[in-house]
């Protein structure tokens, strides 16, 4: 029962992570610049994302512009785009794998296979979490590096945008959720009585012994 609870929690976390990742990738708030004159009033705010950039004037008026040419974009931006999309697709694949092996589905009947699918989905979610983390950390590193580099003029200095924080949250949720799914079946799903064994047992349930419980010295 605890295992089922962990599975549900794991999937809920990964779903939240996926939604966070989607929002993070879509929002044009990876890099933020607040252009401030000598007064404390912000003249304008520029948001830059993976797909577009937006300018918010002090009047509140906002204008967004989708990046024109794919080839004209910096390579790190192209890589971030690709990794973001791949991470989301990998997480979706992980969800499909999980659904195939979930306790409440009948896609796969055999309990061992179900456990293996859940474990696989957990690993896939962890991979998705890592893939989400790469562009977010890379972008954050570039922003921080440029911010403290005296050779970068003020017009080129940026700050960490909300999308990066969402990306970190997404990655954390995917890693945590995937980790929980991996933990629900530590020994390939053989920790409990087999579905068939339980049906024919008499007084004591037959517990299958793990390979490590047999003496191995006779099998050199």
């Amino acid at each position: 029962m605890a295992s089922a609870g962990m599975q549900i929690l794991g999937v809920v976390l990964t779903l939240l992570g996926w939604v966070n990742g989607l929002v993070s990738c879509a929002l044009p708030m990876w890099k933020v610049t607040a252009f401030i004159g000598n007064s404390i009033v912000v003249a304008q705010v520029v948001w830059e994302g993976l797909w577009m950039s937006c300018v918010v004037q002090s009047t509140g008026q906002m204008q967004c512009k989708v990046y024109d040419s794919l080839l004209a974009l910096p390579q790190d931006l192209q890589a971030a785009r690709a990794l973001c999309v791949i991470a989301l697709l990998v997480a979706l694949f992980g969800l499909l794998v999980y659904l195939a092996g979930a306790k409440c589905t009948t896609c796969v009947e055999e309990k061992d296979s179900k456990a293996r699918l859940v474990l696989t989905s957990g690993i896939v979610f962890v991979i998705s979490g890592v893939l989400t983390l790469i562009p977010v950390c890379w972008t954050a590193h570039a922003i921080i590096r440029d911010f403290y580099n005296p050779l970068v003029a003020e017009a080129q200095k940026r700050e960490l945008g909300a999308s990066l924080y969402l990306g970190w949250a997404a990655s954390g949720l995917l890693l945590l959720g995937g980790g929980l799914l991996c933990c629900t079946c530590p020994s390939g799903g053989s920790q409990g009585p087999s579905h068939y064994m339980a049906r024919y047992s008499t007084s004591a349930p037959a517990i299958s012994r793990g390979p490590s419980e047999y003496p191995t010295k006779n099998y050199v």
Partner: antibody
Framework: EVQLQQSGPELVKPGASVKISCKTS????????RHWVKQSRGKSLEWIGT????????RYNQKFKGKATLTVDKSSSTAYMELRSLTSEDSAVYYC?????????????WGQGTSITVSS | DIQMTQSSSSFSVSLGDRVTITCKAS??????LAWYQQKPGNAPRLLIS???SLEAGVPSGFSGSGSGKDYTLSITSLQTEDVATYYC?????????FGGGTKLELK
């Protein structure tokens, strides 16, 4: 007192190269970036490029890429600028300047200037 | 590149005059502007940074103002030692660019 001491005037032939120096004193050499600025006779000022004495990282004005090379020697607190393939257009006074700490592309201290004359 | 335009290349002035030198940027430079004074045969000297902040040792008769694209250097009462060429420079974006200079000449 902050001082930027530049090397003396140079008379060079067309096509030749020249390397001018800028020795600093009165502050920690690696704390501020170093700029080089060109002033042709009776004309305005043109930024050539900048170097971070900490790590030798450079940025150049597109116009001077391939013409100027900036280097530093931390041990002697000296910045250098080499100009190559000189033509009469390169005859000018060249200044080394120190970037303002909080606004590095502003220039708070200037060397006395090095006059380069390109003539055959 | 950002273009810096100083509308007057030279000014005929008298001692004691209030002098105003203007500088216009081709785009908003968010007050990242410096003013320099250069006397013949000398290197430029920084007077004002951040459009309005007077550097240490600069006489209080100098002041800077402006925002956005338009900036002004003012000298309240011109002294003999103020006769020089004045340059504005933006340091908002690279490459940093200078105005063409405004030369003050005594009438």
């Amino acid at each position: 007192e902050v001082q930027l001491q530049q090397s003396g005037p140079e008379l060079v032939k067309p096509g030749a190269s020249v390397k001018i120096s800028c020795k600093t004193s009165g502050y920690t050499f690696t704390e501020n970036i170093r700029h080089w600025v060109k002033q042709s006779r009776g004309k305005s000022l043109e930024w050539i490029g900048t170097i971070n004495p900490n790590n030798g990282e450079t940025r150049y004005n597109q116009k001077f890429k391939g013409k100027a090379t900036l280097t530093v020697d931390k041990s002697s607190s000296t910045a250098y600028m080499e100009l190559r393939s000189l033509t009469s257009e390169d005859s000018a006074v060249y200044y080394c300047t120190r970037g303002i700490t909080k606004s590095p592309y502003g220039m708070d201290y200037w060397g006395q200037g090095t006059s380069i004359t390109v003539s055959s | 590149d950002i273009q810096m335009t100083q509308s007057s290349s030279s000014f005929s002035v008298s001692l004691g005059d209030r002098v105003t030198i203007t500088c216009k940027a081709s785009e908003d430079i968010y007050n990242r502007l410096a003013w320099y004074q250069q006397k013949p045969g000398n290197a430029p000297r920084l007077l004002i940074s951040g459009a309005t902040s007077l550097e240490a040792g600069v006489p209080s008769g100098f002041s800077g103002s402006g925002s956005g694209k338009d900036y002004t250097l003012s000298i309240t009462s011109l002294q003999t030692e103020d006769v020089a060429t004045y340059y504005c420079q933006q340091y908002w974006s690279t490459p940093p660019t200078f105005g063409g200079g405004t030369k003050l000449e005594l009438k």
